[in-house]
């Protein structure tokens, strides 16, 4: 699998949109772990609602928040108030039963707010304006590159 | 009208290779898993592997991991399974089973293949 | 591997009876469980998917409850074209199924 980066900006949002086959993935619930180094586990963050009809539900755990529109295709996951220690590799999971599928990679690069260094004044951004999609928002990265690290679950 | 259909009864030696066969029509095959079950002589159902056509993705039962191969070719909406050397074991028939899908999420065998018997003996 | 267990083996009913079949999960499937019931010579039929909904054509005296790893398909009265074998299976982890309830005329 390829890997996607995702670069975002401390202190404000990311936003990760995983697409998967819908018709191919029914019933599943989906997951957004961390990979522990190149060949350790993926240690799960959060998963999707236990009832596969209210997968369209947000669920968080701390800053974390994920839902899935299940006809759609697309878990969707929120990294809230970016910080420093977040940055890693992530992956997106179908799930069944022990089984864990991975749909996609990421890897979250976190840029340091260059306001920080300086008087900012009174210049501030609303949180709905702040955060992340992607590629989709202009002050996000996104770029594929190849890894060697093996699909674990 | 959907449906599976499965290919003829064989009868082999053991030691050889056969591939059975089992062709969807009537509904989009590649959007659906299609799985194998086995059921030996006067016993019941064994589930050995399934396949998604989309993207010919294939998960086995441990107990026949590495024992068959699950193939899929979608352009003419068939799956196969395949020995590469028979036992007199692999005696029994052979059903492939369509994974349907409800709205509640829920999924369950809902459309079968007639069989295939297979016969092994030298 | 998920260990699907069924009881009775053997099930002797008088038609118009009540048949209650029972379907235990060696851990929980959830509500990830069907039956179906096979008549000799014919391929497997299913009967109820997600613990208790009935198929489409299934008549309304079949009916399935439980969750979890305790499961039990009732025949609420016997007709004589449901002396069959019947399957539970589970599909939360792999495709797991029972060994199967034969159930004979009594």
């Known amino acids: 699998l390829n890997t996607t980066v995702l670069q975002g900006m401390a202190g404000q949002s990311l936003r990760v949109s995983c697409t998967y086959d819908a018709l191919k993935h029914w019933g599943r619930r989906k997951a957004w772990c961390r990979q522990l180094g190149e060949e350790g586990p993926c240690q799960r963050v959060v998963s999707t609602h236990g009832v596969w009809l209210l997968a369209f539900l947000k669920k968080r755990n701390g800053s974390t928040v994920i839902a899935d529109d299940t006809l759609a295709g697309t878990v969707t996951i929120t990294l809230k108030n970016l910080q420093a220690g977040d940055a890693g590799l992530y992956q997106c999971q179908s799930l069944r039963g022990r089984e864990a599928e991975v749909l996609q990679k990421v890897l979250v690069e976190v840029l340091e707010d260059p306001l920080d260094d300086q008087d900012a004044g009174d210049l501030w951004v609303p949180e709905e304006s702040s955060s992340f999609e992607g590629a989709q928002v202009e002050h996000s990265t996104s770029r594929n590159q190849e890894t060697s690290f093996p699909p674990t679950s | 009208e959907v449906q599976l259909v499965q290919s003829g009864a064989e009868v082999k030696k053991p030691g050889e290779s056969l591939k059975i066969s089992c062709k969807g029509s009537g509904y989009s095959f590649t959007s659906y898993w299609i799985g194998w079950v086995r059921q030996m002589p006067g016993k019941g159902l064994e589930w050995m592997g399934i396949?998604?056509?989309?993207?010919?993705?294939?998960r086995y039962s441990p107990s026949f991991q590495g024992q068959v191969t699950i193939s899929a070719d979608k352009s003419i909406s068939t799956a196969y399974l395949q020995w590469s050397s028979l036992k007199a074991s692999d005696t029994a028939m052979y059903y492939c089973?369509?994974?349907?899908?409800?709205?509640?999420?829920?999924?369950?065998?809902?459309?079968w293949g007639q069989g295939t018997m297979v016969t092994v003996s030298s | 591997e998920i260990v699907m267990t069924q009881s009775p083996a053997t099930l002797s009913v008088s038609p118009g009876e009540r048949a209650t079949l029972s379907c235990r999960a060696s851990q929980s499937v959830s509500s990830n469980l069907a039956w179906y019931q096979q008549k000799p010579g014919q391929a497997p039929r299913l009967l109820i998917y997600?613990?208790?909904t009935r198929a489409t054509g299934i008549p309304a005296r079949f009916s399935g409850s439980g969750s979890g790893t305790e499961f039990t398909l009732t025949i609420s009265s016997l007709q004589s074209e449901d002396f069959a074998v019947y399957y539970c299976q589970q599909d939360d982890d792999g495709y797991t199924f029972g060994g199967g309830t034969k159930v004979e005329i009594k």
């Open positions: 396949i998604y056509p989309g993207d010919s993705d294939t």
């Open positions: 089973a369509r994974l349907g899908r409800w709205s509640s999420g829920s999924t369950a065998f809902d459309i």
């Open positions: 997600g613990a208790s």
